[in-house]
């Protein structure tokens, strides 16, 4: 998985979307987790409703909310009142049994400069073609969780 970067401004809300194949992930609950350390586990922040049919209901854990459009195939996470400590590497996951499939790796960047608010919440999907719009972030990460090599994003 490449990492998609979402930039938000401190104090504002940031919405992260994770598209997925609605058929492939039919009847699966979803989760949002934070990567801990360079090679650490992905710690669950919030997950969708225990009853998959109610996944559209927004669930909160502190300032983080999750909701799932199971028909359209889009998981949406909202980070309210974004703070610098929210910056980091996250994952959208699809849960099945004790396993979790990574739907998307997300790097959340928090901009302190209000003059740069135009960047807030934007996301970019590098295309499949030879030429694609650049993500305009400090880095992207392509190795999968299974390899245990996901680096912790820089805090500088």
């Amino acid at each position: 998985h490449n990492t998609t970067v979402f930039q938000g401004v401190a104090g504002q809300s940031l919405q992260v979307s994770c598209p997925y194949d609605s058929m492939k992930h039919w009847a699966r609950r979803k989760a949002w987790c934070r990567q801990l350390g360079e090679k650490g586990p992905c710690q669950r922040v919030v997950s969708t409703h225990n009853l998959w049919l109610l996944s559209f209901l927004r669930r909160w854990n502190g300032s983080t909310a999750i909701t799932d459009d199971t028909l359209g195939g889009t998981l949406t996470i909202t980070l309210r009142n974004l703070q610098p400590h929210d910056a980091g590497l996250y994952q959208c996951q699809s849960l099945h049994g004790s396993e979790a499939d990574t739907l998307r790796k997300v790097l959340v960047e928090v901009l302190a400069d209000p003059l740069d608010h135009r960047d807030a919440g934007d996301l970019w999907f590098p295309g499949e073609s030879e030429s694609f719009e650049d993500a305009h972030v400090e880095h992207s990460i392509s190795r999968s969780l299974l390899e245990g090599e996901i680096p912790f994003p820089p805090t500088s």
Partner: antibody, heavy 123, light 112 residues
Framework: QVQLQQSGPELVKPGASLKISCKAS????????MNWVKQRPGKGLEWIGR????????NYNGEFRVRATLTADTSSTTAYMQLSSLTSEDSAVYFC????????????????WGQGASVTVSS | DVVMTQTPLSLPVSLGDQASISCRSS???????????LHWYLQKPGQSPKLLIY???NRFSGVPDRFSGSGSGTDFTLKISRVEADDLGVYFC?????????FGGGTKLEIK
Amino acid sequence: QVQLQQSGPELVKPGASLKISCKASGYAFSSSWMNWVKQRPGKGLEWIGRIYPGDGDTNYNGEFRVRATLTADTSSTTAYMQLSSLTSEDSAVYFCARLLRNQPGESYAMDYWGQGASVTVSS
Amino acid sequence: DVVMTQTPLSLPVSLGDQASISCRSSQSLVHSNGYTYLHWYLQKPGQSPKLLIYKVSNRFSGVPDRFSGSGSGTDFTLKISRVEADDLGVYFCSQSTRVPYTFGGGTKLEIK
């Protein structure tokens, strides 16, 4: 201060391979993209590709994808570019260049460049 | 790929004069985030390129205010208000809105 020190000039035979190094210092090497740029004598600049040393992620310019391999060693803060099956068309100066860190209002140009590594392909 | 076209190829100027270099891209350089990633570099003889202007009009640190960049979409201009001997060299525009990054062919600024 930021410095990018590249390896010396090389004379190689057609068909051979070559590895150029770029030793970085003065900044967080792991968390900045490193670009490689080709300049043939009297010609313009061609972007070869880039690597993110923190995890080895790469993007290549299509025409270089087959013969160029970008790697990085974070322990020595050194980036490498290997070129294979060299021809006279590969005779050029190769630059490494750091991508300006993505700070608010300041992003995505190559702000520091190595001095260039001259490569001559000749039998 | 985005094709960058610079004009003129060569620009003879007298010291103290104003110089203007044009750069045109084959497609819009406006990123989906609203910014335009068009940059200008100067390469002096025997040296590596140096960043002058980033994102159309922002001077990089240490670059004199004689240098200014402008433009939008696909048409961009670098102006040097009072050319000094130290300004001579080849100027390149470059885009990093889309991968692969691409450069213009260069404009050689020389003494008339």
